[in-house]
Interface confidence: low
C-alpha cells in the first residue's frame, strides 16, 4: 500500500481542502473511525488500484487517524493497512468529543492503559490531572493517542490552554475489576429547582458488586420516604448507582441529601452529600455589570460583557436605541450567552471594527416567566482628532486672524503656539505657547459644537494677532485621549509680500 502524500502526520488549516490517495495491488479503501468515508475508487492503467479521499472544508472534527486498507472482501491474506494522522487545529474546539463508552476505562489487574483525550492542535500542551487534586501527573502524552500509563482507580481530567482559555476534557473513570474499596460520587441533575419541578440525584459506586445504599434527605424528618431506584450505570457491571427521584419538589425539600454506601460483606463504607435548593420562583440577578458610559474606539473591536445568575435559564436580548440586535450576517456584531456553571451565565456583545453609527444607548435584558433584569448604558465611540482646516485672513484693521477647525471624540483641546525663527522651527526650536495675552498682543476665541448625527465634537478656534512685525510660524494642535493632530501656517507682516 502506498499513501500520497506520505505523511505519516499532517497539520491542515481549518476550512481547507486536502486530497489523499492510496494505491495498492488490489482494490483499496479508506477508513476513518471504523467508518468508510465517501471516496472515489479507480483501477489504474498499470493494473494497480487506488482510492482518493477528498476532505473538503475541514474542521477540528476531522482530526484523527485514517487507514488505507485492502477491501475486506479480499480475505485475510491482504490484511495490510497503512495509517496516517490528520490534525486540524481549531481554536473553537477543546478536546475531541468522546463516546460515553470511551470515558469508562476497564483494566484487568495492573496493566498499562490509555486515557484517550486528544486535541486538534499538536502544538498544544496537554496535562493530566486527578479530578480531585489540581496537580498535573507526570505521564507521557501522545497527541495522537492520549496519556498512556498505569492508573489507579480514580477519576481523571485532561487540561489544555487555548489562547487565554483553560479547557477541561470530559471526566475519565479508570477502574480495575475486583476493586474492594468503595469510591462514591453523588451528583444531581440540578442543584437548584423550583417548587413543583423534579429532583433527581444519583449516587454512583465504582468497583463493587455487592453494596447497600442508604439515603438521608429532608423528607425523612416528616416520615415521608422515597424509594430509590438502583441501576447499573453506563453498562458496566462494576459501576452501580442508586437514583433518588422526587417528581414534585416542595420548599421543604431544600437541604442536604446524603448517600451512604456500605459493602455488606465487611461493612466498609463511604458517604457523600449534596445540597439541593428548592426555590419558590425563578430568579435573575446581575453579578457583573457595565458602567453608565462605556467607551469604544473607532475601527477597534469591543466586547461588552454582563455576568448574571439565573434559574431557570433566561432568554437574553440586546437592544440598541430600543431596537433588538441580532447576529449580523456580515459579522459586524456577535452575540453570545453561555453557561459558566449551573446557574451562572455570561452574555457578550462583540462589536467588530466599531463604527460611529454604533454609538448610542444599549440595553441587555435577561428574562424568564418569573423574573427579569435589565442593564442600560451609553456607548461612546472615541474618534481620533483631525485638524480639518487652518486658514488665515487679514482684516482691514491690520490684525492677522487665524482660524483652526477640527473634530474628534471625546472633545479635543486646542493649543496654539508660535515660532519666530523659521529656519529652525519646528524641529530645532520649541514653539512658544500662545493664549489670551495680557498685553493684548493675541486674543483667542474657541467654540465647541457636538454633532449628534456624527457623534463627535467640532472645535473652531480663532486666534487674533494684533501686530505681526516679522514672519511667524503658527501651529494649531488638537488633542484628545485618542491622540493629536496639528497643522502650521506661516504668517507674514502686512508690509511683506507672501512667499
Amino acid at each position: 500500500l502506498v499513501i500520497t502524500p506520505p505523511g505519516p502526520e499532517f497539520v491542515l488549516n481549518i476550512s481547507s481542502t486536502f486530497v489523499l490517495t492510496c494505491s495498492g495491488s488490489a482494490p483499496v479503501m479508506w477508513e476513518q473511525m471504523s467508518q468508510v468515508p465517501w471516496q472515489e475508487a479507480a483501477m489504474n492503467q498499470d493494473g494497480t488500484f487506488s482510492s482518493v479521499l477528498t476532505l473538503t472544508n475541514v474542521t477540528g472534527g476531522d482530526t484523527g487517524e485514517y487507514f488505507c486498507v485492502y477491501n475486506n472482501s479480499l480475505g485475510p491474506e491482504l490484511s495490510e493497512r497503512k495509517r496516517i494522522y490528520i490534525f486540524v487545529p481549531d481554536p473553537t474546539m477543546g478536546f475531541l468529543p468522546m463516546d460515553s463508552e470511551d470515558l469508562f476505562i476497564f483494566v484487568t489487574d495492573v496493566t498499562e492503559t490509555t486515557i484517550p483525550c486528544r486535541v486538534t492542535d499538536p502544538q498544544l500542551e496537554v496535562t493530566l490531572h486527578e479530578k480531585k487534586v489540581d496537580i498535573p501527573l507526570h505521564v507521557p502524552y501522545d497527541h495522537q493517542r492520549g496519556f498512556t500509563g498505569t492508573f489507579e482507580d480514580k477519576t481523571y481530567i485532561c487540561k489544555t490552554t487555548i489562547g487565554d482559555r483553560e479547557v477541561d476534557s470530559d471526566t475519565y473513570y479508570v477502574y480495575s475489576l475486583q476493586v474492594s474499596s468503595i469510591n462514591v460520587s453523588v451528583n444531581a441533575v440540578q442543584t437548584v429547582v423550583r417548587q413543583g419541578e423534579s429532583i433527581t440525584i444519583r449516587c454512583i459506586v465504582m468497583g463493587n458488586d455487592v453494596v447497600n445504599f442508604q439515603w438521608t434527605y429532608p423528607r425523612m424528618k416528616s416520615g415521608r420516604l422515597v424509594e430509590p431506584v438502583t441501576d447499573y450505570l453506563f453498562g458496566v457491571p462494576s459501576r452501580i448507582g442508586s437514583i433518588l427521584h422526587i417528581p414534585t419538589a416542595e420548599l421543604s425539600d431544600s437541604g442536604t441529601y446524603t448517600c451512604n454506601v456500605s459493602v455488606s460483606v465487611n461493612d466498609h463504607g463511604d458517604e457523600k452529600a449534596i445540597n439541593i435548593s428548592v426555590i419558590e420562583n425563578g430568579y435573575v440577578r446581575l453579578l457583573e455589570t457595565l458602567g453608565d458610559v462605556e467607551i469604544a474606539e473607532l475601527h477597534r473591536s469591543r466586547t461588552l460583557r454582563v455576568v448574571f445568575e439565573a434559574y431557570p435559564m433566561p432568554s437574553v436580548l440586546w437592544l440598541k436605541d430600543n431596537r433588538t440586535l441580532g447576529d449580523s450576517g456580515a459579522g459586524e456584531l456577535v452575540l453570545s450567552t453561555r453557561n459558566m456553571s449551573e446557574t451562572r451565565y455570561v452574555s457578550e456583545l462583540i462589536l467588530v471594527r466599531v463604527k460611529v453609527s454604533e454609538a448610542g444607548y444599549y440595553t441587555m435584558r435577561a428574562f424568564h416567566e418569573d423574573d427579569e433584569v435589565q442593564l442600560s448604558f451609553k456607548l461612546q465611540v472615541n474618534v481620533p482628532v483631525r485638524v480639518l482646516e487652518l486658514s488665515e485672513s487679514h482684516p482691514a484693521n491690520g490684525e492677522q486672524t487665524i482660524r483652526c477647525r477640527g473634530r474628534g471624540m471625546p472633545q479635543p483641546n486646542v493649543t496654539w503656539s508660535t515660532c519666530r525663527d523659521l529656519k529652525r522651527c519646528p524641529r530645532k526650536l520649541s514653539p512658544t505657547p500662545l493664549g489670551n495675552s495680557s498685553k493684548e498682543e493675541s486674543q483667542l476665541e474657541t467654540n465647541v459644537t457636538f454633532w449628534e448625527e456624527d457623534q463627535e465634537y467640532e472645535v473652531v478656534s480663532t486666534l487674533r494677532l494684533r501686530h505681526v512685525d516679522q514672519p511667524l510660524s503658527v501651529r494649531c494642535m488638537l488633542q484628545n485621549s485618542m491622540g493629536g493632530d496639528s497643522q502650521e501656517v506661516t504668517v507674514v507682516p502686512h508690509s511683506l509680500p507672501f512667499k
Epitope: V210, N212, F213, E227, V229, T230, D231, Y232, P237, I240
Partner: nanobody, 116 residues
Framework: QVQLVQSGAEVKKPGSSVRVSCKAS????????ISWVRQAPGQGLEWIGG????????NYAQRFQGRVTINADESTSTVYMEMSSLRSEDTAVYYC?????????WGQGTLVTVSS
C-alpha cells in the same frame, strides 16, 4: 429475593434476528434497571444496553445502537432484548442482570448460536 428467568437457547442464521426474554419475580420490577450483557467464547463480559422500566427509556452501547432494541412489559414483569442483522461473532451467552440493593442478580443465560 429477586429471580430472573430467561428464555431458552436459540440457533439463528446470519442476517436474521433473535429475541430473548427475561422475566423478573420477587422484587419491585418497575423500579430496578435491567441490563443485558453478553459473553462470547473466551471473551470478557460486554454490556449491550439496559432499561429502567419505570422510565421506559432504554440506553444502548454505541456499537449496538440501531441493531438492538430493549423494551419492558410491566404487566408481565418481562424485559426483552432483540438483536437484528446477526453475524457469526454474535454467538455468545446473553445474560440479563439487575441489582437489588445488597447484591446483583443474574438470569441463567441464553446461548445464541449464529451459524449458516
Amino acid at each position: 429475593q429477586v429471580q430472573l428467568v430467561q428464555s431458552g437457547a436459540e440457533v439463528k442464521k446470519p442476517g436474521s434476528s433473535v429475541r430473548v426474554s427475561c422475566k423478573a419475580s420477587g422484587g419491585t420490577f418497575s423500579r430496578h434497571a435491567i441490563s443485558w450483557v453478553r459473553q462470547a467464547p473466551g471473551q470478557g463480559l460486554e454490556w449491550i444496553g439496559g432499561i429502567l422500566p419505570i422510565l421506559k427509556t432504554p440506553n444502548y452501547a454505541q456499537r449496538f445502537q440501531g441493531r438492538v432494541t430493549i423494551n419492558a412489559d410491566e404487566s408481565t414483569s418481562t424485559v426483552y432484548m432483540e438483536m437484528s442483522s446477526l453475524r457469526s461473532e454474535d454467538t455468545a451467552v446473553y445474560y440479563c442482570a439487575t441489582h437489588g440493593g445488597d447484591r446483583s442478580y443474574w438470569g441463567q443465560g441464553t446461548l445464541v448460536t449464529v451459524s449458516s
